[in-house]
Amino acid sequence: QSSERRVVAHMPGDIIIGALFSVHHQPTVDKVHERKCGAVREQYGIQRVEAMLHTLERINSDPTLLPNITLGCEIRDSCWHSAVALEQSIEFIRDSLISSEEEEGLVRCVDGSSSFRSKKPIVGVIGPGSSSVAIQVQNLLQLFNIPQIAYSATSMDLSDKTLFKYFMRVVPSDAQQARAMVDIVKRYNWTYVSAVHTEGNYGESGMEAFKDMSAKEGICIAHSYKIYSNAGEQSFDKLLKKLRSHLPKARVVACFCEGMTVRGLLMAMRRLGLAGEFLLLGSDGWADRYDVTDGYQREAVGGITIKLQSPDVKWFDDYYLKLRPETNLRNPWFQEFWQHRFQCRLEGFAQENSKYNKTCNSSLTLRTHHVQDSKMGFVINAIYSMAYGLHNMQMSLCPGYAGLCDAMKPIDGRKLLDSLMKTNFTGVSGDMILFDENGDSPGRYEIMNFKEMGKDYFDYINVGSWDNGELKMDDDEVWSKKNN
Amino acid sequence: QSSERRVVAHMPGDIIIGALFSVHHQPTVDKVHERKCGAVREQYGIQRVEAMLHTLERINSDPTLLPNITLGCEIRDSCWHSAVALEQSIEFIRDSLISSEEEEGLVRCVDGSSSFRSKKPIVGVIGPGSSSVAIQVQNLLQLFNIPQIAYSATSMDLSDKTLFKYFMRVVPSDAQQARAMVDIVKRYNWTYVSAVHTEGNYGESGMEAFKDMSAKEGICIAHSYKIYSNAGEQSFDKLLKKLRSHLPKARVVACFCEGMTVRGLLMAMRRLGLAGEFLLLGSDGWADRYDVTDGYQREAVGGITIKLQSPDVKWFDDYYLKLRPETNLRNPWFQEFWQHRFQCRLEGFAQENSKYNKTCNSSLTLRTHHVQDSKMGFVINAIYSMAYGLHNMQMSLCPGYAGLCDAMKPIDGRKLLDSLMKTNFTGVSGDMILFDENGDSPGRYEIMNFKEMGKDYFDYINVGSWDNGELKMDDDEVWSKKNN
């Protein structure tokens, strides 16, 4: 086992919430069996750890939310990988296992006396980010009636409550964006469309939903293809030639694709001289990512994409951008991250990394090239959901009592799940957070359009929205050319 | 939690092997969350439990195999369901968890003394039967370096050692039968073929392999369709009409299907008057099952199917058929099974079931309507594989020593895995058991043909074999008509 994964961020409290964030990148193929993770991550990792710590501080200082009860946490690193996340989840449930070992008399003291435990059980888990990892974690957590609230796992499979009863999410299922894509196709009377999807759960289930819904609307999916994100040039060329063979009839290409699949298509368009021949309609794997279009803007022009609605959270930046390694000691990964971010050595610090020659100077600040994690609002909403669920449960089980009454010791996961499913509150961006019977949240998307804004200057602009079934589009903006 | 699942079959020994068998049917949809299993099973359940117990007796009394070491077991019920199997697997690994709790000082005695454990750790696990369940179990076991040997989980996904390092099987991957099906298509120069597969892992991955291999061989898969086994009449009719529309060119239909999907197709053929128009080539989901063709024999005539080679094991029947509830007390499910099998009440027994009115009489015998589990040979080979792996490990770690030397206390799962992967021995049916680099066993299949043997008498007959890449077919037998 790799020692870095043993690191845990703890914050004490009357009730402990677990969290799984991808503090490090996933293990490379040769390191998978050791479960040795990759480099530290800022957006998907450190920022989320800090969001958890700071959000709990905010909740604990809010007199209207869980009065007389402090929330603590145990944050673990999933490394965006099933095996690592599962191993860490076992740490979460260790306590439940040991308590039942004692019940069954499998742990005994040498002198026959009873043993005691030194760790509070986890009542719920926030995360992890990836759907396939979340599925594995849920398989384990549900055995112990531990609710799980995800902030970015959007796979349709997770809506199946017979399989994933204790799973909820503050993001919609991908079925919603499939619907949004169909609604766009309908709006512009595109009756003959080619389709591409990325191999794997995200692309396959998303495209299946898109095709089913299209069929019901009388839209002909002329031809459908799939490709791996990491496929070679030849595979992408072959695919483009197939799409080309259906021109000019099937000019629209619906792509339920990861970002790197879209990039592969754009690169093949360049090689085959096909810029401008297709109109790409992309799912949120593309969204408004510059790493998808960088260097291939001309091929991407006109693309219409779906993006999950999540404005930046200002108060998080106010907190985060002030953090420094000499004072932020509660985040056990922070020094490692600081050195990685600024490629320098924190001399004299516990986690000093000698691989960096340059010493970190005191003028460094996180404001430099700062980009807030695009899912920040969802992460915070997931934490607040857990707090509101516990609050409602306390109100119902301990009427007229401030704090944890006996009826909440220990916390019953089944009751907490019921309470969470009924939760609704105003989220961090002012939108209503609530859960349907499948534990899913409403679909709210922005519709983006990739345009040439001026000579050799390209950008994504917001041309519409899709909110829980209602599509609004600025048609003039979609079809206008900027660079006249 | 349902109490029946807490039942465990134990057999003491120096080394304990875990096993997961589907002693009960899977929970019905309304019982899934309680993980309350269905009725007791004979072939897939009780027979496999008895096979484990009796095979270990045979191994323990064999002076040449693990001399001075007794093998014991802990058999648990998977109920053919992921959540149940995962819960049971946690019981297997509890011990590892507790030992590390102690290392980390999380379990302490009131007086500060050390705790001790009263249960031997499991060194490996046999089973479970289903691929999707085996995947879940493997995800957990590999975290603790516990090798798993499966006897009927054939999904191609399980060959991926980056994902499933500690997984091995005495059955081939479905990629092999896909290859066998392609070889049959090639042999008869069928260049234009329609394809059908059952929705789900088995059908999808199998058909994908079949299509990839066909393409390489220049075989045109004209049209490819998928359907759920439990789809309605209309869905099957619709599919048959699509297949019909490609007649007479695409008369061969390759079906990588579960048995009930094939049955659905046969029933639709009856409704649409299409008996005899197609030649079905079926995977081992059909094999030689009468429950697939029953009542629809005329539609199935000519079908060529793949069946895993596994002759009955005579010595198992010699043992099993003598078992009686008053003497077979080591199998904790046996009384429940006996009452279910004979629909009677075992009066005065511990597990007497009052739902049966009739009392079981002493003349009852398992010989009545006995059918040996079709996978029996594989179950036994899996157990022997574990024994030979441990034997070879002992020979290498404890040279010149009979019994467990210190180098094997505790048993290191990584070393055991290495030893298992190198294992080869003569299996229960006289064939060589060995594992390739993916932990898979060679593909050995029988080719069956469903024929009209006389007026209104139909049966499967063996018309060939496919052994590790070599197809042998009795062409005259395939194309002859019996009922002249």
Epitope: - | K241, L247, P248, R251, R271, A275, G276, R298
Partner: antibody, heavy 121, light 106 residues
Framework: QEQLVESGGGLVQPEGSLTLTCTAS?????????MCWVRQAPGKGLEWIAC???????TWYANWAKGRFTISKTSSTTVTLQMTSLTAADTAAYRC??????????????WGQGTLVTVSS | ALVMTQTPSSVSAAVGGTVTINCQAS??????LAWYQQKPGQRPKLLIY???DLASGVSSRVKGSGSGTEFTLTISDLECADAATYYC????????FGGGTEVVVK
């Protein structure tokens, strides 16, 4: 041009037998469409009798026709209907028809003009 | 066995009018139903298949509808040439014709 022509009809004694022939021209049996027989008693409705697959030679019959009527393919362009134990109730115009799609249970796309069978003493 | 019941046995309507013929199946046949027109001394002519699809060369005045066990043939803007007997045929788990409906155009 696709055409079906029936022959072999006429007067037959009760309990007698008769074989009708349907000859196809301009039709390729290898296209797989099924050939069937349908009858129509004078002033009455249509009644399906039987169908045959040109590929497998499998046959399908109406329940009432089983045992007395036999459909068979005698060449790549002819189909016959053998009728035994005839009674007055079998008096009808017998038409040959080709299915619209492959399969015994289908609409009939092409019809012959019919041949009259009269069962009388 | 599949049985088809057709109603009415006879119907008359004026030129330019509309007639509706019903057909009931003894079991669920989904959309596996055809309609034919037959004039005296002529062979039957396929009008509709799969309950609502128009056979080639058939006037769009002819419309089929229904599924399961209840089906309808509607002929609008009646012409003299529409005078004939109309038959339904169920083709699912067997072939069976309805008894026929004579349409008289006045």
């Amino acid at each position: 041009q696709e055409q079906l022509v029936e022959s072999g009809g006429g007067l037959v004694q009760p309990e007698g037998s008769l074989t009708l022939t349907c000859t196809a021209s301009g039709i390729d049996f290898s296209s797989g469409y099924f050939m069937c027989w349908v009858r129509q008693a004078p002033g009455k409705g249509l009644e399906w009798i039987a169908c045959i697959s040109p590929y497998s030679d499998n046959t399908w019959y109406a329940n009432w026709a089983k045992g007395r009527f036999t459909i068979s393919k005698t060449s790549s362009t002819t189909v016959t209907l053998q009728m035994t134990s005839l009674t007055a109730a079998d008096t009808a115009a017998y038409r040959c028809a080709r299915t619209m799609a492959i399969g015994a249970y289908n609409p009939f796309k092409l019809w012959g003009q019919g041949t009259l069978v009269t069962v009388s003493s | 066995a599949l049985v088809m019941t057709q109603t009415p046995s006879s119907v008359s309507a004026a030129v330019g009018g509309t007639v509706t013929i019903n057909c009931q199946a003894s079991q669920n046949i989904y959309s596996n139903l055809a309609w034919y027109q037959q004039k005296p001394g002529q062979r039957p002519k396929l009008l509709i298949y799969d309950a609502s699809d128009l056979a080639s060369g058939v006037s769009s005045r002819v419309k089929g509808s229904g599924s399961g066990t209840e089906f309808t043939l509607t002929i609008s803007d009646l012409e003299c040439a529409d005078a004939a007997t109309y038959y339904c045929q169920g083709y699912y788990s067997g072939n069976a014709f309805g008894g026929g409906t004579e349409v008289v155009v006045k």
